[in-house]
C-alpha cells in the first residue's frame, strides 16, 4: 500500500479516505500513487503550502466538511493531474489569488456551502478547461464583471443561495457552451436585458426564489436551446407578450409562487414539448380564451391557489394531451358548460375549496375519460340529472363539505350515489345540509319521505331556508361524519438538494414533483 | 340554543405551545364549518383559521403556516387549535366561530366568549 | 387581500344616518361581511354576501358595493348600536378584516 496513514483507509492504493475529529492536519505520508483523495469531518482549520506534494498523480480531491477557514496560495501545487476538486461544507471566507494555478486539468471545482464574501477574475484565470464551478451557498453579494471570461469551457455554474442583489448583463458574456445556469435563493429583483444573450447553449436557468418583479422582452431571445426555466417563488406580476415566445425546447416551466393577476392569450408559446405547466399560488383572476392555446402537449397544469372567478369557454382550447387540470381553491361560482369541451384526454380534475353553486349539465360531456373528479367544499346543493353517466372510468368523486339539499329534486343524484358508492370512498360521504330537520343524514341513505317537497328559491341566498342562517337548536343532532383529511403536503425535488414545501392536493393523482432546478 | 364554549388558554412562553379547545352544543356540529378569530389586546380582529364541516379542508393565515394546526372531532362536537412554536405576538384573545354553512365561509353566525392566550417571558 | 375602513372612527348622534365603507385592494367580487362588536363581546354578524341581511339583525342595516368599495349604512342609529364595526372578506385566502371603525356617540 506504499504506506497508508494510520488515520486513514486505502481501499485500493490509488483511493484514500482519511476521516474523523482526531484529524487536524493532512496525514502524512500518503500514498504517491494515490489518485483519489477524501479529506472528510476531520478538525482540520488550514491547508498549508503544499502538503500534496508527493501525490502529483491525483486525479480527485475531496476536502469536505471540515473547520477550514485558510488555505495557503500554494496548497494545491503540484497537482498538475488534478481534475476534480472539492472544497465544498468548510468555513473558507477567502480564497488566496492563485489557490488554483498549475491545475490545468480541473474540470470540476465545487466551492459551495462555505462562507465566500467575494470572488474575483484572477482566481479563475488559470482554470481555462473547468467545466463545472459550483459556488452555491456561501455569501457572494455580487459578481465582478470578468470573473469567469477565462472559463469558455464552463457547462455547469451554480450561484444559488447566495445574497446576490444584482447581475451584471456583462458577467455570463463569454460562457457560450454553458447548460447550466443556477441562480436560485439569491436577492435578486431584476435581471438586465442581454444578461443571457450569449448563453446560446443554455438548457436550464434556475431563478426560482428570488425577488425578481419584472422580466425585460426579450431576456431569454438568445436561447432557443432552453429545455427547463425555473421562476417560481419571485414577485413576477406581469409577462411581457414575448417573453415565452423563442424557447421551442422548453419542457419545463414553473411560475408558481408569483404575482401573476392575468394571462394574456398565445403567452406560452409555442412550445411543442412541455408537458407540466406550474401557476399555483399567484393572484390570477381570469382566463381568457385560447391563453394555452400553444401547447398542444401539456399534461398536467396547475391553476390552483389563484383567485380564478371566471373562465372563459375556450380558454383551454388546444390542450387536447392534458391529463391532470388542478382548479382548486380559487373562487369560481360559475362555469359555462363548454369549457372543459377540448379536454379529450383529462383523467383528473381537481374544483374542490371553490364557491361553485351548480354545475351545468353537459359540464364533463366530452372527458368521457374522467378517472377523478374532487368537487368537496363548494357550495352545490344539487347536481344535473345524468351528469356523471357517461363517465365509465370515474373511480373517485369527492362530494363532501357541500351543502346538499335534500328535497325531492335530490332524488336521481342520490339514487346515482347508491349505485356508486364505491367511487365516494369510504371515509368522507355527502350529507344533506337542508331542509334542517335531515340536516347531517347521509345523502345516500336519507329517507326522501322525511324531505320536504321541492321549493325553488331565489338564487341569493343559496341556502334556501326561512333564512340562510337559521337558528338550528330546535333540531336534534342526527348523523356525524368523522373528521379526514384529504391535503396532503408533497415536497417538491430541487436538482441541487433545495427544497420547498407546497400544499397541492397532488397525492390523490399519485405523481411525483420535481419542479425546480 | 348554540353555544360555544373555548377553552385551553393561559400563559406560555415564547416558543411554547397551547391547544385550544372548543365545545360546540346545540347544532349538528358535523355540517358547519368552523374558524378561529383572535384578537389582540386594544387591536381588531385577526382571522386565524377554518376548517370544514368533515375536517377535509383547512386554511390559515400567513403568519401561523407551519405553527397552528386546526382540526376537529365531530364525534365529540370539538374544534381545537394546536399552537407551537409561540410568538409575543401570537398573544390575543381566541375566539372559537360557527360558520354559516358546511363549506369554508367567512360568515360566523355564533362565536364563543374567548379564552385568552399570553407569550411571554 | 388588505381592507381599508374608513372613516378609522366617527361620532353621531341617536337616529343619523351612518355610513362606513371598506375598500379592497383587489376585486373580491361580493364576497364580504360586516361585523358588529362592542367592548368585551364577541363579534356579530350583520351582513353577508356584500348586501344580505343575517337573520335578526335589524333593518336599519344594510350593504352594498361590489369588487372593491363596500358600504354598511344604519339608517337611523340606535343607542344599542354604538360599537366598533369590521368588514370582513373571504374572498381569498387567508381571509382578512379591515382595520375597524368605531362609532362614538357624539357629545
Known amino acids: 500500500y506504499y504506506g497508508c496513514p494510520s488515520e486513514c483507509t486505502c481501499s485500493r492504493a490509488s483511493q484514500v479516505e482519511c476521516t474523523g475529529a482526531r484529524i487536524v492536519a493532512v496525514p502524512t505520508p500518503l500514498p504517491w500513487n494515490a489518485m483519489s483523495l477524501q479529506i472528510l469531518n476531520t478538525h482540520i482549520t488550514e491547508l498549508s503550502e503544499s502538503p500534496f506534494l508527493n501525490i502529483s498523480a491525483l486525479i480527485a480531491l475531496r476536502i469536505e466538511k471540515n473547520e477550514l477557514s485558510h488555505i495557503m496560495p500554494g496548497a494545491f501545487r503540484n497537482l498538475g493531474s488534478l481534475r476534480y476538486l472539492s472544497l465544498a461544507n468548510n468555513k473558507l471566507q477567502v480564497l488566496p489569488i492563485g489557490l488554483f494555478q498549475g491545475l490545468d486539468s480541473l474540470e470540476s471545482l465545487l466551492l459551495s456551502s462555505n462562507q465566500l464574501v467575494q470572488i474575483q477574475p484572477a482566481h479563475f484565470s488559470q482554470c481555462s478547461n473547468l467545466k463545472e464551478l459550483q459556488l452555491h451557498g456561501n455569501h457572494l453579494e455580487y459578481i465582478p464583471d470578468g470573473a469567469f471570461d477565462h472559463l469558455v469551457g464552463l457547462t455547469k455554474l451554480n450561484l444559488g443561495k447566495n445574497s446576490l442583489t444584482h447581475i451584471s448583463p456583462r458577467v455570463f458574456q463569454h460562457l457560450g457552451n454553458l447548460q447550466v445556469l443556477r441562480l436560485y435563493e439569491n436577492r435578486l429583483t431584476d435581471i438586465p436585458m442581454g444578461t443571457f444573450d450569449g448563453l446560446v447553449n443554455l438548457q436550464e436557468l434556475a431563478l426560482q426564489q428570488n425577488q425578481i418583479g419584472l422580466l425585460s422582452p426579450g431576456l431569454f431571445h438568445n436561447n432557443h436551446n432552453l429545455q427547463r426555466l425555473y421562476l417560481s417563488n419571485n414577485h413576477i406580476s406581469q409577462l411581457p407578450p414575448s417573453i415565452f415566445m423563442q424557447l421551442p425546447q422548453l419542457n419545463r416551466l414553473t411560475l408558481f409562487g408569483n404575482s401573476l393577476k392575468e394571462l394574456s392569450p398565445g403567452i406560452f408559446g409555442p412550445m411543442p414539448n412541455l408537458r407540466e405547466l406550474w401557476l399555483y399560488d399567484n393572484h390570477i383572476t381570469s382566463l381568457p380564451d385560447n391563453v394555452f392555446s400553444n401547447l398542444r402537449q401539456l399534461q398536467v397544469l396547475i391553476l390552483s391557489r389563484n383567485q380564478i372567478s371566471f373562465i372563459s369557454p375556450g380558454a383551454f382550447n388546444g390542450l387536447t394531451e392534458l391529463r391532470e387540470l388542478s382548479l382548486h381553491t380559487n373562487a369560481l361560482q360559475d362555469l359555462d358548460g363548454n369549457v372543459f369541451r377540448m379536454l379529450a384526454n383529462l383523467q383528473n380534475i381537481s374544483l374542490q375549496n371553490n364557491r361553485l353553486r351548480q354545475l351545468p349539465g353537459n359540464i364533463f360531456a366530452n372527458v368521457n375519460g374522467l378517472m377523478t373528479i374532487q368537487l368537496q367544499n363548494n357550495q352545490l346543493e344539487n347536481l344535473p340529472l345524468g351528469i356523471f353517466d357517461h363517465l365509465g372510468k370515474l373511480c373517485e368523486l369527492r362530494l363532501y363539505d357541500n351543502p346538499w339539499r335534500c328535497d325531492s329534486d335530490i332524488l336521481p343524484l342520490r339514487n346515482w350515489l347508491l349505485l356508486n358508492q364505491p367511487r365516494l370512498g369510504t371515509d368522507t360521504v355527502p350529507v344533506c345540509f337542508s331542509p334542517a330537520n335531515v340536516r347531517g343524514q347521509s345523502l345516500i341513505i336519507i329517507n326522501v319521505n322525511v324531505a320536504v317537497p321541492s321549493v325553488h328559491v331565489p338564487e341569493v341566498p343559496s341556502y334556501p331556508e326561512t333564512s340562510w342562517y337559521p337558528d338550528t337548536s330546535s333540531y336534534p343532532d342526527t348523523t356525524s361524519i368523522s373528521s379526514t383529511t384529504e391535503l396532503t403536503s408533497p415536497v417538491e425535488d430541487y436538482t441541487d438538494l433545495t427544497t420547498i414545501q407546497v400544499t397541492d392536493d397532488r397525492s390523490v393523482w399519485g405523481m411525483t414533483q420535481a419542479q425546480s432546478g | 340554543q348554540v353555544q360555544l364554549l373555548e377553552s385551553g388558554g393561559g400563559l406560555v412562553q415564547p416558543g411554547g405551545s397551547l391547544r385550544l379547545s372548543c365545545a360546540a352544543s346545540g347544532f349538528t356540529f358535523s355540517t358547519f364549518a368552523m374558524s378561529w378569530v383572535r384578537q389582540a389586546p386594544g387591536k381588531g380582529l385577526d382571522w386565524v383559521s377554518v376548517i370544514s364541516g368533515t375536517g377535509g379542508s383547512t386554511f390559515y393565515t400567513d403568519s401561523v403556516k407551519g405553527r397552528f394546526t386546526i382540526s376537529r372531532d365531530n364525534s365529540e362536537n370539538t374544534l381545537y387549535l394546536e399552537m407551537n412554536s409561540l410568538r409575543a405576538e401570537d398573544t390575543a384573545v381566541y375566539f372559537c366561530?360557527?360558520?354559516?354553512?358546511?363549506?369554508?365561509?367567512?360568515?360566523?353566525?355564533?362565536w364563543g366568549q374567548g379564552t385568552l392566550v399570553t407569550v411571554s417571558s | 387581500i388588505v381592507l381599508t375602513q374608513s372613516p378609522s372612527s366617527l361620532s353621531a348622534s341617536v337616529g343619523d344616518r351612518v355610513t362606513i365603507t371598506c375598500r379592497t385592494s383587489q376585486v373580491i367580487r361580493n364576497d364580504l361581511g360586516w361585523y358588529q362588536q362592542k367592548p368585551g363581546k364577541a363579534p356579530k354578524l350583520l351582513i353577508y354576501d356584500a348586501s344580505s341581511l343575517q337573520s335578526g339583525v335589524p333593518s336599519r342595516f344594510s350593504g352594498s358595493g361590489s369588487g372593491t368599495d363596500f358600504t354598511l349604512t344604519i339608517s337611523s342609529l340606535q343607542p344599542e348600536d354604538f360599537a366598533t364595526y369590521y368588514c370582513?372578506?373571504?374572498?381569498?385566502?387567508?381571509?382578512?378584516f379591515g382595520q375597524g371603525t368605531k362609532v362614538a356617540i357624539k357629545r
Open positions: 366561530a360557527k360558520a354559516v354553512t358546511v363549506n369554508t365561509r367567512g360568515f360566523f353566525d355564533y
Open positions: 370582513l372578506q373571504d374572498n381569498n385566502y387567508p381571509w382578512t
